[in-house]
Each structure stands twice: as structure tokens, then as C-alpha cells.
Amino acid sequence: MEADKDDTQQILKEHSPDEFIKDEQNKGLIDEITKKNIQLKKEIQKLETELQEATKEFQIKEDIPETKMKFLSVETPENDSQLSNISCSFQVSSKVPYEIQKGQALITFEKEEVAQNVVSMSKHHVQIKDVNLEVTAKPVPLNSGVRFQVYVEVSKMKINVTEIPDTLREDQMRDKLELSFSKSRNGGGEVDRVDYDRQSGSAVITFVEIGVADKILKKKEYPLYINQTCHRVTVSPYTEIHLKKYQIFSGTSKRTVLLTGMEGIQMDEEIVEDLINIHFQRAKNGGGEVDVVKCSLGQPHIAYFEE
């Protein structure tokens, strides 16, 4: 804040070199600016917090399991342009988490109509040991999930170059990069274009022929000499990633039902799960074939729903 005051005094001096503002006036003005400053800082902080919260809402962190790929056939490309990129696409669907609170259970039936019937009956009397417990069946209120396609294109004509030293002017560095990457002794070849960004110290180099990029990428580094000094720049594949068909979905589960009203039970969860399973297997109780039961009598559990 002291620095702020000094700055303000300096500004006042610069703006009125001939006028001498009274100390009191001056002090009042500084106080006003300082107050305004504090107010603005608070506002910035508030907005930053809001922004962070908003960002969190739209972030998705998913552990995508490893998928085994089945190689089916070799495609014969119709023309060279099909060889200039390797493309692949992944369908990603997020699992929707649901927290089963203490005294709740989730039951999944094999058939949708059974689940609907159990919900429509609402109240169910389940015999748990010597207790006849009234549970309530409800639809499961799910949070929204996402589904999208990740489309990845790996270029066979372009490479990414990073860690380029900031030792030359932009036009000269562009020349230097083109010259270095065109030298066949280092695995280079004829360069079509160089897109260099001095600020990030990176470039995208496009070659004329297919295969040059692959040769260069066999090594992770490439020598770039500038005034007798060897700088080792990092080379990596040039990939373009597109997000396609992004869909947000929400709704209720068709085969799973939420059971509530078991707060007072002091028993092993697995035993209660078995008893619920037995009760809802019976048609006379409005049930049918059960897939799975998950019960929470102590700590809340997370259940994941997928399409």
C-alpha cells in the first residue's frame, strides 16, 4: 500500500508540476484512491472465486479404462493424401456417480417394468430378521452425465518443435529452423512451411514429403546450431484433437430403484442386501429378477451408473 501511495503522489506531481495542492487535499485524495483500491481487490477476489467454481462445474475427470483393440484388416489408400495423417476416434461416456446415503439402498432389476412397478407401489414391508421394516421405493435422481467423441489426427507431414531458444529475431529463427530441418544428414527433408511462435518458443514444421517427420521423430531431440552453440530442441508428433458430438444427458435410471427408510438398522450390510434381494425377487411383492443390491447402513457409498 505504501508503494501505491508513492505512485499516486508521483502521478499528482507529474500532472500538476506548477500547482501545489495542499497536503490535506492530497491526503484525502490518496485515502479515497486507497479505499477504491481495496474495494476493487475484493471485487476481483470475488469474481475469481466465482470463476473457479464455474470452471469446476464444467470440468470432467474420468479414468478411461484400457481398451483392447482388435486388428481387422489393412486398408489400401486411394491416394497419398490418406497417408498424410493417422486418424482415430474414441467414444467417451462418463459414468454418473450417485451417493447412497446411510439408511438407503439401490436395487437394480433385470426388467424395466419390474422397477417401474416397485416405484409405483411406493411403500414396501420388508422382513429384516425379526423387524418388519417399511421402506419407500423412489426413482433414482441422477446428476447429468456427458457423452462425446474424441477425434485425434496424427500428422505424418508435420512435427512440433519446442524449447526453441529465444536467441534470434523471428524471421531469422524461421530461416534457421527451415535450414536445420531440411538437412538430410540429420534425417530432415524439404520443408514446406515453418510456423514459429517466438513467445512460446515453439514451431510447427511441415515437410513436403511423407516419411520425413517419422524419421526425425525417431529421436526426441534435434540439433539447432546458432552462432556455434548447439541447442537441442525437442521434437514431437503434431496432433490435432477435436471434440465432437458433445452431449450432456440427465434423467432417472429405468432399472434401478432407490429404497429409503433403513436408518435404524444395526446389521451387516451384506445380510441386509440378501434379505432385500429375497423380498424383491418375489412377484407377490411386486418384484422380479434382481441384478444387484447395494446397501448403505454406515458410511455413504458411491454407485456409478452407465448407459
Epitope: 529475431r169 530461416d175 534457421k176 527451415e178 538437412k183 514446406d192
Partner: antibody
Amino acid sequence: SLEESGGDLVKPGASLTLTCTASGFSFSSSYYMCWVRQAPGKGLEWIACIYAGSSGSTYYASWAKGRFTISKTSSTTVTLQMTSLTAADTATYFCAREYSYDDYGDFWGFNLWGPGTLVTVSS
Amino acid sequence: ALVMTQTPSSVSAAVGGTVTINCQASQNIYTNLAWYQQKPGQPPKLLIYGASNLESGVPSRFKGSGSGTEYTLTISDLECDDAATYYCQSSLYSRIADRANAFGGGTEVVVK
């Protein structure tokens, strides 16, 4: 080889375009194509260079900026446009290829020259 | 700007003798120095590049040396055909200025 053309006798204030044509090779990333001049009985004076690679970056001697323009018109020709000519511009104008001798562009040399074309500025 | 200062402007020596030409750059040119020979009515001919590397076809009587800002061309076992004007030249990449190119003022070698 390289060959210059367009040299002429012109009046002060006039403009002139010189052309350099390469044969036996075409421009590539390993070269800068340049113009150098030599006034009668004087030394060599560098004017400008253009990178023969894809970027076509241009570089000029400080005295040449604004009045001289180097450009690549094809993969084998380079031109030098000169404006507001004065008697001091009277010289033999050489087209030269500046070649990168090492793999890294640290050692350069004008390893190919044209025979030169004479430009005379006189009223 | 890059400035190349060449000395002497003229030198004479007898056939079989040795001449030394000096070239000073206004800044470090990292041994990126070339030497040229020019005879009247002809374009220059490259003799040496990278301060000390002989261009193909150039006799080994021509020797280049130096580093930083100081460079030398030595011609030994002088022949009549060596009578010519010799120029040093450098080009320099830079972070703050255009890529510069400059020639020295030239040294006339007279063979007696």
C-alpha cells in the same frame, strides 16, 4: 550458373529492375539469394538477400532499405527493384548465391556469382 | 551494424613470398568468415569459408585463421596469378537486428 539482366543507363530519379536467373539449380533452404554491387574502382558492397526457402525472408543493408526491394519471382529468378536512383548508384550489380556450408547454417559463403550487369545513372 | 575492417589496403611481395591480410569484425562473428579473390573485370571467387575451410579447387597455399573478431588470410609461395584484390566477408544472425552481411574494404596484392 547465375545471370543478371536489366542493367541500363538511366537518369537520376529513375527506377530500374534487375533480374537474376539461375540455371542448373533451383532455390532451396540451403541458400540466400543476394545482390552485391561494386562502383567503378571501388570495393564490394552488400545490398540485400532473400531466403530461398519457404519463408522468403528478406534482409537489407541499412542504406538500401526503402529504395531497394528484393523479391523471389519463381524458383529460379530473383529481382531487385531500385527507385530514386542517383549517380552514387552507378555500379556493376552482381547476383550471388550465399550457401550454407555446414549442416546448421553457421558457415556461409557466396559460392556462385553472376558476371554482373552495369547500371549507369547520369543526366 | 556489422562492419568489417580490412588491413592493409595494399601489399606487395615477390614471387615465392608470403603475404598476410587482416580482417577485423565490429562484433563476434563466431568464425563465420569468408575470403574472396577478385581479378579486374571478373566477379569475386570464394577461397575460404568458416574462417579456415578451403573451398574445393583452391590451392592449399591459401590459409585462413582466426576467431572472435580477428581473422587472417595468409598466401604463401606467391605466384603471379595471385595478383588480385582480396575481400573478407561475414554474415551474422542476430536477436536484435536484421541478419547482416558485410564486406571488408579490400586488399590489393601486387606480385613483383
